[in-house]
């Protein structure tokens, strides 16, 4: 058993049929010595008396809010949560496996630049009685500070018969140099509590590996005289690290119709303009990627050909 | 400690071309190592990230773009002194700081070159003959060093009398290649910045 936060405790249980469970001793936070009784949740049934209560925790029915009272007055609470371990593996029932970039990916993180700011998100099908708490650091043995905000519900989607909820959190490394060469990864730890179930999820990454620039901005077209060709120009996204001559991007320019199966014109360039062949009912799209360290491409920025 | 936006001569950047070749060569070599050594811990997640130039050179700090010198987190650098005559430099107009930066890059390359050559000598003794360093990568390091053209004491190639542990050597190769790729990215950024300045 360990303390998650004040008056909230996590009991770690090996979860298999007829498991013995864990013996837990609760102590009432009071100077009083006698006349103390214990109850669980809203029940008025007295579970025991005395300053300490010893319980055998085996299943979710044994978890919950234990309260010690004296003469009708509440003295203190202890909330017990369960953390299940099945076949030596901690349960991951609360969050959905996003399977990208690999299986058992519950947390996904992205950074728009090298400033040390990043966003992580996760998915669940659970809609109520759910809380998250996020901590982060650079490195684990001698951790350096990363400050994370509160996790918020950022999107709701319908997937077949199920509703899916996306939560996200923004974090900022306390003293980040955009030009630094990372040798210690960022660690992100998410505590998830659903009713009386506790789970924790972690992710470890270098900012350089989770870079995904915003799409290029201000796409403009200029038809070339006596030609089917069009000059398309754009600018670096505002959120990208500066100076741009140091933090350079490379671009992919594509002309394509509405269907991905349609024919296309595609060209890669380090410049902020390119010449392509425009077709009726097609769109010109441009996306960006760090020129020197191949992490993710940005989403496409598009303009119609006509 | 930073690169001022001085205007280099047009002839400044044979180094840009060489640095692009360097990044390409080390990336290819790393990819080859990851494929060949698939049953060794050779991915970014599996290895320890070590920097053999730590406390010996200060390339990131010495080559910091002017715009980032206002960022205090970028300025916790160590004092290091370097030689200052290089052919990538924009003749006499080049600032002292730029010379420091380029000579720091030169020192990095020299250290990695020695490590890679020592390691290759060991890998050549491996009866499995599983992996060797790409000669192209070694040649590209040499070309960039020549383009930088700093005079500096030659570092003797480390020789070892004991029987090499090939497993450890291959893991060290992965660690070195990952670190060198990151440094090659920095070098490419610096050369691009200088070229644009």
């Amino acid at each position: 058993i360990w303390e998650l936060k004040k008056d909230v405790y996590v009991v770690e249980l090996d979860w298999y049929p007829d498991a013995p469970g864990e013996m837990v001793v609760l102590t009432c936070d009071t100077p009083e010595e006698d006349g103390i009784t214990w109850t669980l949740d809203q029940s008025s049934e007295v579970l025991g008396s005395g300053k300490t209560l010893t319980i055998q925790v085996k299943e979710f029915g044994d978890a919950g809010q234990y309260t010690c009272h004296k003469g009708g007055e509440v003295l203190s609470h202890s909330l017990l949560l369960l953390h299940k371990k099945e076949d030596g593996i901690w349960s991951t029932d609360i969050l959905k496996d996003q399977k990208e970039p690999k299986n058992k990916t519950f947390l996904r993180c992205e950074a728009k630049n090298y400033s040390g700011r990043f966003t992580c998100w996760w998915l669940t099908t659970i809609s109520t009685d759910l809380t998250f708490s996020v901590k982060s650091s650079r490195g684990s043995s001698d951790p350096q500070g990363v400050t994370c905000g509160a996790a918020t519900l950022s999107a709701e989607r319908v997937r077949g018969d199920n509703k899916e909820y996306e939560y996200s959190v923004e974090c900022q490394e306390d003293s980040a140099c955009p030009a630094a060469e990372e040798s210690l990864p960022i660690e992100v730890m998410v505590d998830a509590v659903h009713k009386l179930k506790y789970e924790n999820y972690t992710s470890s990454f270098f900012i350089r590996d989770i870079i995904k620039p915003d799409p290029p901005k201000n796409l403009q077209l200029k038809p070339l005289k006596n030609s089917r060709q069009v000059e398309v120009s754009w600018e670096y996204p505002d959120t990208w690290s500066t100076p741009h001559s140091y933090f350079s991007l490379t671009f992919c320019v594509q002309v394509q119709g509405k269907s991905k199966r349609e024919k296309k014109d595609r060209v890669f360039t380090d410049k902020t303009s390119a010449t392509v062949i425009c077709r009726k009912n097609a769109s010109i799209s441009v996306r960006a990627q760090d020129r020197y360290y191949s992490s993710s491409w940005s989403e496409w920025a598009s303009v119609p050909c006509s | 400690r930073n690169l001022p936006v001085a205007t280099p001569d047009p002839g400044m950047f044979p180094c840009l071309h060489h640095s692009q070749n360097l990044l390409r060569a080390v990336s290819n070599m790393l990819q080859k190592a990851r494929q060949t050594l698939e049953f060794y811990p050779c991915t970014s997640e599996e290895i320890d990230h070590e920097d053999i130039t730590k406390d010996k050179t200060s390339t990131v700090e010495a080559c910091l773009p002017l715009e980032l010198t206002k960022n205090e987190s970028c300025l916790n650098s160590r004092e290091t002194s370097f030689i200052t005559n290089g052919s990538c430099l924009a003749s006499r107009k080049t600032s002292f700081m730029m010379a420091l930066c380029l000579s720091s890059i030169y020192e990095d390359l020299k250290m990695y070159q020695v490590e890679f050559k020592t390691m290759n000598a060991k890998l050549l003794m491996d009866p499995k003959r599983q992996i060797f360093l790409d000669q192209n990568m070694l040649a590209v390091i040499d070309e960039l060093m020549q383009a930088l053209n700093f005079n500096s004491e030659t570092v003797p190639q480390k020789s070892s009398l004991e029987e090499p542990d090939f497993y450890k050597t291959k893991i060290k190769l992965c660690i070195l290649l990952h670190a060198f790729r990151i440094r090659a990215v920095t070098i490419d950024r610096v050369m691009s910045y200088l070229n644009a300045s």
């Epitope: 024919k263 890669f268 360039t269 | -």
Partner: antibody, heavy 118, light 107 residues
Framework: QVQLVQSGAEVKKPGSSVKVSCKAS????????LHWVRQAPGQGLEWMGW????????EYAPKFQGRVTITADESTSTAYMELSSLRSEDTAVYYC???????????LGQGTLVTVSS | DIVMTQSPLSLPVTPGEPASISCRAS??????LHWYQQKPGQAPRLLIY???QSISGVPSRFSGSGSGTDFTLTISSLQPEDFATYYC?????????FGQGTKVEIK
């Protein structure tokens, strides 16, 4: 299986024209760009131009501009390349090529040898 | 027009040995570079597109690298069927242009 089948070899006199055909099978004809590339005996490859069969748009290499015409007939899934004012240096194997991507070729025809000789 | 220069023009190689062909562009072309193989009496066949992207059906011993002006086609271990002429082609701008070709011959 996508195939491009070209017309047979031709012998032409200098100053005349030649029209080479390229019939596509497998896949929808208008879903691909069609190009023409030539190769003089013992020489390298030379791009001549492309057509978008969907709308008839064409683009020619400046070297051949005014002398080459690329057309396409959607009803027969056939593309044509006509080269006029032939000279001896036009002796070459002419390939039609196609792709959904405009700027390179994933399938080429078997080639048509055009010999220009007096 | 962008001029593509291949080297060497002739490459004698022992079967089983690796081979590398270089292609240089007269100006920067990013990764807009494609490689073809041509055997005598046959049409060219696409091997690699956009500098390093492999084509399904092409053996994995063929790989491409490079960006900007310098590109390399590598055959990790030459098989008898790989003796042919190899061409690079730029698609950065029209007109599309090819290298002169590199003939890989049996040593």
């Amino acid at each position: 299986q996508v195939q491009l089948v070209q017309s047979g070899a031709e012998v032409k006199k200098p100053g005349s024209s030649v029209k080479v055909s390229c019939k596509a099978s497998g896949g929808t004809f208008s879903d691909y760009y069609l190009h023409w590339v030539r190769q003089a005996p013992g020489q390298g490859l030379e791009w001549m131009g492309w057509i978008d069969p969907e709308n008839g748009d064409t683009e020619y290499a400046p070297k051949f501009q005014g002398r080459v015409t690329i057309t396409a007939d959607e009803s027969t899934s056939t593309a044509y390349m006509e080269l006029s004012s032939l000279r001896s240096e036009d002796t070459a194997v002419y390939y039609c090529a196609r792709n959904k991507e405009l700027r390179y070729f994933d399938v080429l025809g078997q080639g048509t040898l055009v010999t220009v000789s007096s | 027009d962008i001029v593509m220069t291949q080297s060497p023009l002739s490459l004698p190689v022992t079967p089983g040995e690796p081979a590398s062909i270089s292609c240089r562009a007269s100006q920067s072309i990013s990764i807009n570079l494609h490689w073809y193989q041509q055997k005598p009496g046959q049409a060219p066949r696409l091997l690699i597109y956009f500098a390093s992207q492999s084509i399904s059906g092409v053996p994995s011993r063929f790989s491409g690298s490079g960006s900007g002006t310098d590109f390399t086609l590598t055959i990790s271990s030459l098989q008898p069927e790989d003796f042919a002429t190899y061409y690079c082609q730029q698609s950065n701008s029209f007109p599309l242009t090819f290298g002169q070709g590199t003939k890989v011959e049996i040593k």
